[in-house]
């Protein structure tokens, strides 16, 4: 039975040209995390494998940095980066947990972080 929950940074906003940290945290389970994948829509951005470490997609290597922790840092943001991001936790023996973050990249300096929320 899957008992875990993923807490994410929720709906967030950031300024064009700036950076943002995408964070997810898996709790309430003793399952072993074997890999975390970060995806934007259906594009794979990065992988953090428990055995072999971080792998950044060649398409994003200039704008994506690993961490902190199992999170992901997006740099040199553009308006096109607006959209849904998913952290996909592959665990044993539970299976897969998915968290969702919505990022809005703003032209102006009025960007502010949204509230955290949980995905069961």
């Amino acid at each position: 039975m899957m008992t875990g929950t993923i807490e994410t940074t929720g709906n967030i906003s950031a300024e064009k040209g700036g950076s943002i940290i995408l964070q997810c945290h898996l709790s309430s389970t003793t399952a072993q995390v074997t890999q975390v994948n970060w995806e934007q829509q259906d594009q794979l951005l990065a992988i953090c494998n428990a055995d072999l470490g971080w792998h950044i997609s060649p398409s994003f290597k200039d704008r994506v940095a690993p961490g902190p922790g199992l999170g992901l840092t997006l740099q040199s943001l553009t308006v096109n980066d607006t959209g849904e991001y998913f952290c996909i936790y592959h665990t044993y023996p539970d299976g897969t947990y998915t968290g969702r973050i919505f990022l809005e990249v703003l032209e102006s300096s009025v960007a502010e972080h949204g509230a955290r929320f949980q995905i069961p």
């Epitope: 074997t34 259906d42 992988i47 055995d51 897969t96």
Partner: antibody, heavy 121, light 108 residues
Framework: QVQLVQSGAEVKKPGASVKVSCKAS????????MHWVRQAPGQGLEWMGI????????SYARKFQGRVTMTRDTSTSTVYMELSSLRSEDTAVYYC??????????????WGQGTMVTVSS | EIVMTQSPATLSVSPGERATLSCRAS??????LAWYQQKPGQAPRLLIY???TRATGIPARFSGSGSGTEFTLTISSLQSEDFAVYYC??????????FGGGTKVEIK
């Protein structure tokens, strides 16, 4: 040209160990992951594990953890797969296969010729 | 682990006809899917990677499509040398990387 050459066929008794080698040539050995895949007679392909030849990090399928060890010798561009506590079900052809660059992931574009391992009393 | 399911298990096709092979992943693998061909007594050979990109030296009659969980390998006009077993594989989540059970393409 890029190629992987494996060691010859082996016959082992149950409980013994086997060590298969895979020598790479024609490319920069350290830059690509190496995988091991096996195929029992008349069966499909089964992934066993992966090694990063640059730094020696490994990841094994849970089924083989505790029984398999993958190592490499960068001076000879050779990877090794050792499987211990052999049983009859381990009778199979064992393949090494080159994966993607160690900075990302990739399909298996180059395969060794295979090594037949027979476990029989 | 991600389970890869191939269908059909066996496909009987006449030379010159089109063959369509299916592969389904139990969860999304984006486009990180490969197809391999294996003939008796030989090692597998990479045909398609990235779901739709032909590997070096692979004839244009082989094409791959799909993303997410549903994938297809199409052989537009089967040649005698194409009769073999075909495997799909996801290479995005490990351990373990996983293969489908294979589809045997045989002469009708």
């Amino acid at each position: 040209q890029v190629q992987l050459v494996q060691s010859g066929a082996e016959v082992k008794k149950p409980g013994a160990s086997v060590k298969v080698s895979c020598k790479a040539s024609g490319y920069t050995f350290r830059e690509y992951y190496m995988h091991w895949v096996r195929q029992a007679p008349g069966q499909g392909l089964e992934w066993m594990g992966i090694i990063n030849p640059s730094i020696g990090l490994t990841s094994y399928a849970r089924k083989f953890q505790g029984r398999v060890t993958m190592t490499r010798d960068t001076s000879t561009s050779t990877v090794y797969m050792e499987l211990s506590s052999l049983r009859s079900e381990d009778t199979a052809v064992y393949y090494c296969a080159r994966g993607g660059r160690t900075t990302w992931i990739g399909a298996f574009d180059i395969w060794g010729q295979g090594t037949m391992v027979t476990v029989s009393s | 682990e991600i389970v890869m399911t191939q269908s059909p298990a066996t496909l009987s096709v006449s030379p010159g006809e089109r063959a369509t092979l299916s592969c389904r992943a139990s969860q999304s693998v984006s486009s990180n899917l490969a197809w391999y061909q294996q003939k008796p007594g030989q090692a597998p050979r990479l045909l398609i990677y990235g779901a739709s990109t032909r590997a070096t030296g692979i004839p244009a009659r082989f094409s791959g499509s799909g993303s997410g969980t549903e994938f297809t390998l199409t052989i537009s006009s089967l040649q005698s040398e194409d009769f073999a077993v075909y495997y799909c594989q996801q290479y995005v989540v490990w351990p373990p990387l996983t293969f489908g059970g294979g589809t045997k393409v045989e002469i009708k």
